[in-house]
Interface confidence: low
């Protein structure tokens, strides 16, 4: 055309886009039948003219489907939703080793789409543990392994450990370790780890407790240092002396072994005997002096005191009046306070 400004129309309009294959907004999820309660499986798809469940390769009866259509709030799309119930009886009736499974098939004008398979299993938890923890007595600071193999179950049981009925949290107490095979390890046994330990297995069906294992952390006794030797039993000559130690470093605890060996030692001892001093004989009297006295002396030498023996007691010098010789009566008398009646003082001999 020659009209400028007029719009040129296409010879033909493109056809509307083809409807896409159905897309699942919700696929059926694995489920467990607890006791006799049936499970619900649910599918949501868009766009979908029909949705049906297929279980174990066979179509589920149309009557067993509950179907509804509505707007998806999140997308504003018109979606189709379907749900079925699966009973315990249906699952039990499936013979063979395969699990009971269901999947959705959705149709649109573009074709069909299959959802994932959802497996339906009968949940259970057997009563007996495959392995239960054993009580044990362990030395202080040693590593302890408590084993637990939970009962067989579907779904597989989760395991937790109790210490005196409190749940052990290894992130709070790093002395505890939980291994992937459900064992409990006490890294270094402390006295406070003396306790009752229980393995607990639980799943959606039940909770089972193992027998309780008592762990006793013991301390073997250790000797204290030896005390000083006692004095020799005899003050003089051959005797005995002893020393002792006690099983207190540490003292045995929680059934730990008592110390091995002797708590006391005895040994012979010889003490050199003390010799008490004794006087020699008195000397002869001296001549009469100008002081009208004469004298005699003796010594603590028969024998002298030895090895801590006692000194002699008594006087070293003895004097008495005399009137012969050079005596002058007007001189000092024996009653004079400065009289030379001397006593031994200490170990000095005075003359």
């Amino acid at each position: 055309g020659t009209d400028s400004g007029s719009e040129v129309l296409p010879d033909s309009f493109p056809s509307a886009p083809a409807e896409p294959l159905p897309y699942f907004l919700q696929e059926p999820q694995d489920a467990y039948i607890v006791k006799n309660k049936p499970v619900e499986l649910r599918c949501r798809a868009f766009p979908a003219t029909q949705i049906y469940f297929k279980c174990n390769g066979e179509w589920v009866s149309q009557n067993d489907h509950v179907t509804q259509e509505g707007l998806d709030e999140a997308t504003g799309l018109r979606v189709r939703e379907v749900q079925i119930e699966v009973s315990r009886q249906q699952v039990e009736e499936l013979f063979g080793l395969e699990d009971y499974w269901c999947q959705c098939v959705a149709w649109s004008s573009a074709g069909t789409t299959k959802s994932r398979r959802a497996y339906v299993r009968i949940a259970y938890l057997r009563k007996n543990f495959d392995q239960e923890p054993l009580g044990k007595e362990v030395p202080l600071d040693h590593e302890v392994l408590l084993q637990c193999r939970p009962p067989e179950g579907v779904p597989v049981a989760e395991v937790e450990w109790l210490k005196n009925e409190d749940v052990i949290d290894p992130t709070q107490d790093t002395n505890f370790l939980l291994t992937i095979d459900h064992n409990l390890i006490i890294r270094q046994a402390r006295l406070s780890d003396t306790a009752n330990y229980t393995c607990v297995a639980k799943n959606i069906v039940a909770k089972r407790r193992s027998t309780t294992a008592t762990v006793i952390v013991y301390v073997n006794g250790g000797w204290s240092s030896w005390a000083e030797w006692s004095p020799c039993s005899n003050r003089c000559g051959r005797g005995w002396q002893k020393r002792t130690r006690t099983c207190t470093n540490p003292a045995p605890l929680n059934g730990g072994a008592f110390c091995e060996g002797q708590a006391f030692q005895k040994t012979a001892c010889t003490t050199i005997c003390p010799v008490d001093g004794a006087w020699t004989e008195w000397s002869k009297w001296s001549a009469c002096s100008t002081e009208c006295a004469h004298w005699r002396s003796r010594e603590c030498m028969a024998p002298p005191p030895q090895n801590g023996g006692r000194d002699c007691s008594g006087t070293l010098l003895d004097s008495k009046n005399c009137t012969d010789g050079l005596c002058m009566q007007n001189k000092k008398t024996l009653s004079d306070p400065n009289s030379h009646l001397l006593e031994a003082s200490g170990d000095a001999a005075l003359y």
């Epitope: 362990v138 040693h142 590593e143 392994l145 992130t171 370790l177 939980l178 291994t179 992937i180 890294r187």
Partner: antibody, heavy 115, light 106 residues
């Protein structure tokens, strides 16, 4: 004082056998986990085997399963590693060690597998 | 089997530097991770156990932390005696070591 002393290393031909010993002192191996860990020349650490003697509880690395056997004689306070069908790639320093977070190690013993 | 991916494989640093080594577990290992230091010709030495517990006798400049399946060893101020190779190890399901990180002098 805790000590671990390995012995028994040496030169052996491929296909041959060797028995390593780990003598422990300062603690009772009955109540601890004992490991063998190896280190090939210039390479990193590789865990080999584990025993908890109180239970006779043992584990092995896939690389040695069926060829190596870990054992313990608690009366001698000693752990062992029996190595059979040795290969060139088993050449390494073998360490004996104690505990889950391994707190004590021996000084190591060299095993050379070569023709 | 659980893999422990350690990084970097080597690093150069100076005395006084802050050094960080990481290990990633291929699946959850709780806090069951230990860190070791090894010097040439010597046996490894335990530094950290249970992800963040400092082993007795180890200087406080060493620390460990956990975030999910990521584990970190930090040396707050590198000392001359810290130049060595460091290994992580998980002991949650059997035992696996990381490949090692060599800390060298810059």
């Amino acid at each position: 004082e805790v000590q671990l002393v390995e012995s028994g290393g040496g030169l052996v031909q491929p296909g041959g056998s060797l028995r390593l010993s780990c003598a422990a002192s300062g603690f009772n191996i009955s109540y601890s986990s004992i490991h063998w860990v190896r280190q090939a020349p210039g390479k990193g650490l590789e865990w080999v085997a584990y025993i908890y003697p109180y239970y006779g509880y043992t584990y092995y690395a896939d690389s040695v399963k069926g060829r190596f056997t870990i054992s313990a004689d608690t009366s001698k306070n000693t752990a062992y590693l029996q190595m059979n069908s040795l290969r060139a790639e088993d050449t390494a320093v073998y360490y004996c060690a104690r505990g889950y977070g391994i707190d004590y190690w021996g000084q190591g013993t060299l095993v050379t597998v070569s023709s | 089997d659980i893999q422990m991916t350690q990084s970097p494989s080597s690093l150069s640093a100076s005395v006084g530097d802050r050094v960080t080594i990481t290990c990633r577990a291929s699946q959850s290992v709780s806090s069951a991770v230990a860190w070791y230091q090894q010097k040439p010709g010597k046996a490894p030495k335990l530094l950290i156990y249970s992800a963040s517990s400092l082993y007795s006798g180890v200087p406080s400049r060493f620390s460990g932390s956990r975030s999910g399946t990521d584990f970190t060893l930090t040396i707050s101020s590198l000392q001359p005696e810290d130049f060595a190779t460091y290994y992580c190890q998980q002991h949650y399901s059997l035992f696996t070591f990381g490949q090692g990180t060599k800390v060298e002098i810059k």
